[in-house]
Interface confidence: low
């Protein structure tokens, strides 16, 4: 059955209640230079409009503080109102390493990110940090790597490993949950000139992730005791016509091309899904596509296999799919899939269908295919036009969390966290935020607060209290380090 009655029950005490933000652009300088500059200035407002130092006058200074960054104050105010236990945000690789290698490290950017993490910890909010978050408009790569063919160039994977190592070294004492790459399975939207470009870029992204995981596993895990994975875009697929076999096959094929493409090599075999490889090969043989999945060497399979500590899924909606034979040598046509927009379904302004039961089906599919592992939903949300009373978002959150709870209570899926997407919206973008672009709170915040404080949807008389030891204590030493380690 698709929809089942709501359940009453609670998530475990160590469940991560999170909110996700995309790339945080680091502020280059703290907003309060007067605290570190002992000189007094007067502003020549009517003349040359410059600041002129007053000679012979020295002011008391104080060390720079994290809260001198205006952005951080804003972030913290929003996070405090969200009452979350975890905050997922992404670093800007291009800001941290403008040259793409370790020859020019932007220490100020790293200090900014360290401040975001450490100030969050003071509020009891742990960070899940994403190292690389490409967006469709912008690849987010350092300029030199972009000009050297980006992810089509295998050396970008080596550069990523060095960047990851730097971040683990600089932030790993405070950060215990890492995402290497956000939605590498959606980079097909950018590397779409040909299927071979798409599969080649994907291969290099897989290698980049695995190199970073291996580096962490050996060099940093013994002392930092953290966990590393990558976030896959993981929408569920249903046959548009449940009575058509070809539609069922198309739905499974969608999941193979979308999720298994990355999950199979990392979680299971070290190689691409046989179903995907065979489907592309059969189209190749029939002259319908010249695409081919890369052949992996034994060393590459060794490198990829098992390089995840947990499963991280970004789930937004369910797609209704049907089979349609498509000619052409691109990833989209290799799949032979057509999407159907079901106008009878509740949908968002950007046509995202609200299909709560899809997330439960997804979680069961992942467990069935990849075993009983810890799963985090690292982004889940909907766009809602309302600037104050965002009812669609409240409905979405309530219903999707209900299905996640069913997966936990009934299906015994090891779900460890849910990260709502996203903290604040950006100007002229679909409205996914809990806060407007000018930081005004929406009413869905109170709804999410209530779910968090209740740990789900408890029975009337059940306690939502957790003892200190049961709560999410993944970073007990972090607060100590925040105080002791210079920022």
């Amino acid at each position: 059955k698709e929809s089942t009655p709501d359940v009453q029950g609670q998530f475990p005490c160590d469940f991560s209640w999170g909110v996700t933000e995309s790339v945080l652009k680091p502020e280059s300088v703290a907003s309060s230079p007067q605290f570190s500059d002992p000189h007094l200035y007067v502003w020549n407002a009517t003349g040359n409009r410059l600041l002129h130092r007053v000679e012979g006058v020295r002011l008391k200074t104080r060390p720079a503080q994290c809260t001198d960054f205006v952005n951080i104050k804003k972030q913290l105010e929003m996070l405090a109102r969200m009452k979350v236990t975890h905050y997922r945000f992404a670093l800007d690789w291009a800001s941290v390493l403008p040259t793409g290698n370790l020859s020019a490290v932007n220490r100020q950017a790293l200090r900014y990110y360290r401040c975001v993490v450490s100030e969050g910890l003071k509020l009891g909010i742990s960070a899940m940090v994403t190292l690389y978050y490409p967006t469709h408009a912008h690849l987010g790569l350092p300029e030199p790597l972009l000009h050297a063919d980006g992810w089509l160039n295998p050396s970008t994977a080596e550069a990523f490993q060095a960047y990851a190592g730097l971040c683990f070294q600089e932030l790993g004492d405070l950060v215990k949950l890492w995402i290497t790459i956000n939605e590498p399975n959606r980079l097909s939207d950018i590397y779409n000139r040909s299927g071979n470009d798409t599969y080649g870029a994907a291969h290099n992204l897989l290698v980049a992730h695995a190199l970073a995981w291996r580096l962490y596993d050996r060099q940093f895990r013994p002392s930092q005791r953290g966990a590393v994975s990558l976030s896959l875009h993981a929408d569920w697929a249903e046959p548009a016509n449940p009575y058509a076999d070809s539609h069922w096959r198309a739905a499974e094929r969608f999941l193979q091309f979308e999720i298994a493409w990355f999950a199979e090599p990392l979680f299971k075999t070290g190689d691409y899904p046989a179903a995907m490889r065979e489907y592309i090969a059969s189209k190749h043989r029939r002259g319908l596509s010249s695409s081919a999945l890369p052949r992996l060497t034994e060393a590459e399979r060794r490198l990829l296999k098992g390089t995840v500590d947990f499963c991280a899924l970004n789930h937004f909606t369910t797609r209704f799919v049907m089979h349609e034979q498509l000619a052409g040598s691109r990833y989209d046509s290799d799949r032979d899939i057509q999407f159907l927009q079901d106008i009878t379904r509740l949908s968002s302004p950007t046509r995202l269908a609200v299909i709560p039961w899809g997330v439960r089906k997804l979680l069961r599919w992942v467990r069935r295919n990849y075993g009983d592992m810890d799963i985090y939903i690292t982004a889940s949300g909907i766009d809602d036009q309302a600037l104050e009373d965002d009812r669609l978002r409240k409905y979405y959150l309530g219903k999707y969390l209900q299905e996640v709870l069913k997966a936990y209570l009934i299906d015994k899926v090891r779900i460890k966290g849910y990260y709502a997407f996203k903290l604040a919206e950006e100007k002229s973008k679909p409205r996914f935020g809990f806060f407007t672009s000018d930081f005004k709170a929406k009413s869905s915040i109170q709804f999410y607060n209530k779910v968090i404080s209740s740990r789900g949807f408890p029975f009337e008389n059940s306690s939502s209290r957790c003892s200190q030891t049961q709560e999410n204590t993944e970073c007990t030493v972090c607060l100590f380090l925040v105080q002791k380690k210079p920022l």
């Epitope: 580096l215 034994e298 060794r302 098992g306």
Partner: antibody, heavy 120, light 111 residues
Framework: QVQLQQSGPELVKPGALVKISCKAS????????INWVKKRPGQGLEWIGW????????KYNEKFKGKATLTADKSSSTAYMQLSSLTSENSAVYFC?????????????WGQGTLVTVSA | DILLTQSPASLAVSLGQRATISCRAS??????????MHWYQQKPGQPPKLLIY???NLESGVPARFSGRGSGTDFTLNIHPVEEEDAATYYC?????????FGGGTKLEIK
Amino acid sequence: QVQLQQSGPELVKPGALVKISCKASGYTFTRYDINWVKKRPGQGLEWIGWIYPGDDSTKYNEKFKGKATLTADKSSSTAYMQLSSLTSENSAVYFCARSDYYGSRSFVYWGQGTLVTVSA
Amino acid sequence: DILLTQSPASLAVSLGQRATISCRASKSVSTSGYSYMHWYQQKPGQPPKLLIYLASNLESGVPARFSGRGSGTDFTLNIHPVEEEDAATYYCHHSGELPYTFGGGTKLEIK
């Protein structure tokens, strides 16, 4: 916790062969290399080679090719080293040690060592 | 093969003082920003114990009096202040390329 348990001491005759074992526990056996290291009295440590139990691939120090053969049994999480055509030069303590090929490749976990004595 | 030359072959250090052991590689063991040089301590009848990995990283559970530094071809292990239990043989080990090799060892005696 991670443990590597090696087989007991061996007294063997020149020209014979010996097979020593290293049983791993506390981690996923197929995910990490098992290295073998030789230590002779009054001398330093020598790396013999590694086996990756995930696919049974091996790498040897040229000096030990033909002398040492590394194998692994996934079902029992045990790695083996066979030494053939033994001479007094092969009398030593042999250690197994775990490393991660794509990490730093240092050896964190070691077996207790197996003493092999070659004597007529 | 990369030859690792350790010096001195032996040294005696008073309790509480500093012990410095150096290791020189016949060619660089540094690549992609990491130096694949490690240090081990071995006591009689025991397997070696990893102290420092990747030139300067302290292995979990190892006292902070052990430290490592260096890159390229020259590396040092420092122990300060030396304690009674530090009497042992110390080896450097590179894993930059195959075959991996070890230094000849330095025997540390406590006066």
